[in-house]
């Protein structure tokens, strides 16, 4: 017997062949003998089965003695034994149809779990293999589960059923839900407008839902919201923002916020949650800033950062085209007495200058300049 | 040649009935089903029904359900068309035709035309 | 049942015009759909079945194609012996319906 396998919405043909190359009466049975389709003479005749209106045929093939049965819009239930009669002989083929469903929705937010559920026909014993957009194999039975969802998992995942040595394939789309980057840090010298973008890591028609940024500030005890604000199909409103400081909010995407000046008191970080509507869980993203200030006060030049910064950074105070005057793994550096000329405070990471900020000393009798 | 020879035209009154005959020769009578088809003056074509004579088996439009009767004489090769309650609306030209399961209705009778008229 | 529409319902046309005439179905009927010619007094000729089969003895000039709903007759040039009616008729689904005809005229 043929073993045909189909899946779940799609339109399988199983075919029947005479020996005789012309049209001649030919009919189509289940397995409990309800005729399904045939015909009489040239005509078309359809049967009193479930598959009444999703049957079909194609009438430019029977001439050539083929008879297809075409069943449209496949069920699990359509799994069965079909019979062909033609020219007093039968043809059995039967007919498997599988169907491959992700739990609930396709769009994921990143670190939820995917669970596909494979539908079959009783009595079947299938496997089911599936690769990931990054090349990833899950194997399994009736259900797969990957936790803990990546980016890097969002597009096109490919799973082969297999059922008696044949084998179907499934495509379906996965999003995953995320913000492009989970961190991010801005550098800025004090005074400086500071611009937070949030972009993200996908596109849907219609994106709806709230947003909050919180923020601890490294000179505060506590966090504090800084703004409140909604999504409604891409387009975006603030519903609540701080007095200090005021910050402004983009109304298209991506989500993007602006600090109009860096403060040593706003340093610190933040943490931009993202609720969408009709998915549980949230969007988050990290976002640091790291302010510097350099001073000179009577005969003492200091330079400053604030902020969350990595023990490995230095900061250098230095002399326009000398060397380094001081250079320290700390938060602060100062130098006495410091000659008159340009000189450069730099925040830097392995050699590459992160922040930079420069102050004139004047000589003695002068006040000092801050370009 | 395949040929289908019909009866000669009638004259009905309403309420009345008529039965159209339709002789095959030329071919196997048993091996083609028997369509019927309606033409009124100045009008389209009408699909009434169908007969396969081996075994008599019919299919009839919903449309005259109950009123036409399609039957065949394998032994005279003949097909026949009753149908009954005629009305003024049935004045029309009635063709038997031949349909091969090759070709659908590749042989036509000369076509009968039939008046009710009180 | 299905029903058949024919466009256009009357057509005027010259010989050596390519001509087109259309026939929509109600439902899918797959490639179930015949064409006929008629001329007056006369019994229908079976010119295409299965949608694009020419019926043996007719000239090619007349082509037929579509699947699913949509459906179209061609006479490619057009001869004096073409001006007739045109009829569809779907085999898909009983009551085998026509289309309302098309008359096909000289200009």
């Known amino acids: 017997k043929k073993v045909v396998l189909g899946k779940k919405g799609d339109t399988v043909e199983l075919t029947c062949t005479a020996s005789q190359k012309k049209s001649i009466q030919f009919h189509w049975k289940n397995s409990n003998q309800i005729k399904i389709l045939g015909n009489q003479g040239s005509f078309l005749t359809k049967g009193p089965s479930k598959l009444n209106d999703r049957a079909d045929s194609r009438r430019s093939l029977w001439d050539q003695g083929n008879f297809p049965l075409i069943i449209k819009n496949l069920k699990i239930e359509d799994s069965d034994t079909y019979i062909c009669e033609v020219e007093d002989q039968k043809e059995e083929v039967q007919l498997l149809v599988f169907g491959l469903t992700a739990n609930s929705d396709t769009h994921l937010l990143q670190g939820q779990s995917l669970t596909l559920t494979l539908e079959s026909p009783p009595g079947s014993s299938p496997s089911v293999q599936c690769r990931s957009p990054r090349g990833k194999n899950i194997q399994g039975g009736k259900t797969l589960s990957v936790s803990q969802l990546e980016l890097q998992d969002s597009g096109t995942w490919t799973c082969t059923v297999l059922q008696n040595q044949k084998k179907v394939e499934f495509k379906i789309d996965i999003v995953v839900l995320a913000f492009q980057k989970a961190s991010s840090i801005v550098y800025k010298k004090e005074g400086e407008q500071v611009e937070f973008s949030f972009p993200l890591a996908f596109t849907v028609e219609k994106l709806t839902g709230s947003g909050e940024l919180w923020w601890q500030a490294e000179r505060a005890s506590s966090s504090k919201s800084w703004i409140t604000f909604d999504l409604k199909n891409k387009e975006v409103s603030v519903k609540r923002v701080t007095q200090d400081p005021k910050l402004q909010m983009g109304k298209k995407l991506p989500l993007h916020l602006t600090l109009p000046q860096a403060l040593p008191q706003y340093a610190g970080s933040g943490n931009l949650t993202l609720a969408l509507e009709a998915k549980t869980g949230k969007l988050h993203q990290e976002v640091n800033l790291v302010v510097m200030r350099a001073t000179q006060l009577q005969k003492n030049l200091t330079c400053e950062v604030w902020g969350p910064t990595s023990p490995k950074l230095m900061l250098s105070l230095k002399l326009e085209n000398k060397e380094a005057k001081v250079s320290k793994r700390e938060k602060a550096v100062w130098v006495l007495n410091p000659e008159a000329g340009m000189w450069q405070c730099l925040l830097s990471d392995s050699g590459q200058v992160l922040l930079e900020s420069n102050i004139k000393v004047l000589p003695t009798w002068s006040t000092p300049v801050q370009p | 040649q395949v040929q289908l020879v019909q009866s000669g035209a009638e004259v009905k009154k309403p309420g009345s009935s008529v039965k159209v005959s339709c002789k095959a020769s030329g071919y196997t009578f048993i091996t083609s089903y028997i369509h019927w088809v309606r033409q009124a003056p100045g009008q389209g074509l009408e699909w009434m029904g169908m007969?396969?004579?081996?075994?008599?088996?019919?299919t009839y439009a919903q449309k005259f359900q109950g009123r036409v009767t399609i039957t065949a004489d394998e032994s005279t090769s003949t097909a026949y068309m009753e149908l009954s309650s005629l009305r003024s609306e049935d004045t029309a030209v009635y063709y038997c035709?031949?349909?091969?399961?090759?070709?659908?209705?590749?042989?036509w009778g000369q076509g009968t035309l039939v008046t009710v008229s009180s | 049942d299905i029903q058949m529409t024919q466009s256009p319902s009357s057509l005027s046309a010259s010989v050596g015009d390519r001509v087109t005439i259309t026939c929509r179905a109600s439902?899918?009927?797959?490639?179930?759909l015949n064409w006929y010619q008629q001329k007056p007094g006369k019994a229908p000729k079976l010119l295409i079945y299965?949608?694009?089969t020419l019926q043996s003895g007719v000239p090619s000039r007349f082509s037929g194609s579509g699947s699913g709903t949509d459906f179209t007759l061609t006479i490619s040039s057009l001869q004096p012996e073409d001006f007739a009616t045109y009829y569809c008729q779907q085999s898909y689904s009983s009551p085998y319906t026509f289309g309302q005809g098309t008359k096909l005229e000289i200009k």
């Open positions: 299965a949608a694009s």
């Open positions: 035709a031949r349909d091969s399961s090759g070709y659908p209705i590749d042989y």
């Open positions: 007969i396969n004579p081996s075994g008599g088996t019919t």
């Open positions: 439902h899918h009927i797959s490639d179930f």
